[in-house]
């Protein structure tokens, strides 16, 4: 019989009949090693490859370029998949991005983008987005006109300041922009008035730090 093709992403996993959310191994084009990822098979039809997750503040997101490049954390909890992997996955075919958010009052919201991919390392993993919809604000809290990725040791933003140092975490900062899902985790009661928190401006404003976030991608033709 024909040899089974390895899974390129969680959409392949889902279409192979695995419809339970959990950790799966995927084989990304041009990457030497397979990668363990969390697959969300419940939200909006399933098939989502989780590239970022925050939930309890157990993981330090104030890291340098190399760590954001290769990823950190564990797909069973808080993690960043890694820019090199995000670049490789989104180079395979066209992807959409969905971001799930929850505030400390238990309100949930999402932002979805019809097109999502990032540039390679030489392009500072520049963000490319199109077609914003969702409940987390009428306007996009991710920079639509393109922003380079910055970390505490790689200042690629459009500010006279150093956004990643000041606001903590690695992100597609502008000057510094209306979002930072990799900021400091603040617990309930401590999450107001924070410059460097987990921010999604058009959901909860400029200085409210969110409780949980999930960034996930799925092929456009799923």
């Amino acid at each position: 019989r024909e040899e089974e093709k390895p899974f390129r992403d969680c959409a392949d996993v889902y279409q192979a009949g695995f419809n339970k959310s959990g950790i799966y191994t995927i084989y990304i084009n041009n990457m030497p090693e397979p990668k363990k990822v969390f697959c969300n098979m419940d939200v909006n039809g399933g098939g989502w490859t989780v590239i970022q997750h925050r939930e309890d503040g157990s993981l330090d997101f104030q890291r340098g370029w190399k760590e954001y490049k290769m990823g950190f954390g564990n797909p069973s909890g808080e993690y960043w998949l890694g820019n090199e992997f995000i670049f490789a996955i989104t180079s395979q075919r066209q992807y959409m991005l969905r971001i799930e958010l929850m505030d400390w009052e238990g309100n949930r919201a999402y932002s979805q983008y019809d097109r999502f991919h990032i540039g390679n390392e030489k392009q500072n993993y520049r963000l490319y987005l199109k077609g914003h919809t969702g409940t987390a604000g009428k306007q996009s809290s991710l920079i639509l006109h393109g922003a380079d990725f910055s970390t505490k040791d790689a200042d690629n933003d459009n500010c006279m300041c150093k956004c990643a140092l000041m606001l903590t975490g690695g992100w597609w900062f502008d000057a510094c922009g209306p979002s930072n899902l990799n900021g400091m985790f603040y617990t309930a009661g401590q999450n107001h008035g924070k410059l460097n928190g987990i921010k999604w401006h058009y959901f909860k404003g400029p200085s409210y730090s969110l409780r949980s976030t999930t960034m996930m991608i799925r092929p456009l033709d799923f």
Partner: antibody, heavy 122, light 112 residues
Framework: EVQLVQSGGGVVQPGRSLRLSCAAS????????MHWVRQAPGKGLEWVSY????????YYADSVKGRFTISRDNAKNSLYLQMNSLRAEDTAVYYC???????????????WGQGTLVTVSS | DIVMTQSPLSLPVTPGEPASISCRSS???????????LDWYLQKPGQSPQLLIY???NRASGVPDRFSGSGSGTDFTLKISRVEAEDVGVYYC?????????FGQGTKLEIK
Amino acid sequence: EVQLVQSGGGVVQPGRSLRLSCAASGFTFSSYGMHWVRQAPGKGLEWVSYISSSGSTIYYADSVKGRFTISRDNAKNSLYLQMNSLRAEDTAVYYCARDLLDYDIWTGYGYWGQGTLVTVSS
Amino acid sequence: DIVMTQSPLSLPVTPGEPASISCRSSQSLLHSNGYNFLDWYLQKPGQSPQLLIYLGSNRASGVPDRFSGSGSGTDFTLKISRVEAEDVGVYYCMQGTHWPPTFGQGTKLEIK
């Protein structure tokens, strides 16, 4: 390149009005809070007024409250200061200034206009 | 309003020598979010002010590394490790922790 180009200064009699303008370019104007700061001849800097990125939040210094009105037109990338009931003590160079950070996170003035002199004299 | 007091008000310096300006506030500038909203600006003769230091100790892009800011709460310092001729002008500290924003009186740095 970020630019703030000011216009509208001049000599005016006490009690009269004047409108200052600040044309912005080189950045997404609608994302930034904007300020007016003034400097009387030979004196230090004094904050005058602030308007948030959307125009929904406005503050004034006590010395100009009720007489000055700050406004913005995001479609035209422009900031304004309408000055009514002018007094001799309002004589100063007026600067428009942009917040360092966008989306109403205020950490000071990242960019300044070139300044425009307002002289209130009879 | 918060009163910002700078010293000295006049600072004659020999090129190559260090310089230090103090700024004291009438109330603590340490915000509940952990930041000191204290900036330093330089106004060169005939020019608009320019940002040097933000949030107490962060150098703005393009500012030479001979400039440094330090301090927390009510006491802040701007240091220039080696003064150059182009550093002449009036230096202002400004607080933004408490509304309204207020400036110090300014320190005039001149070359001896």
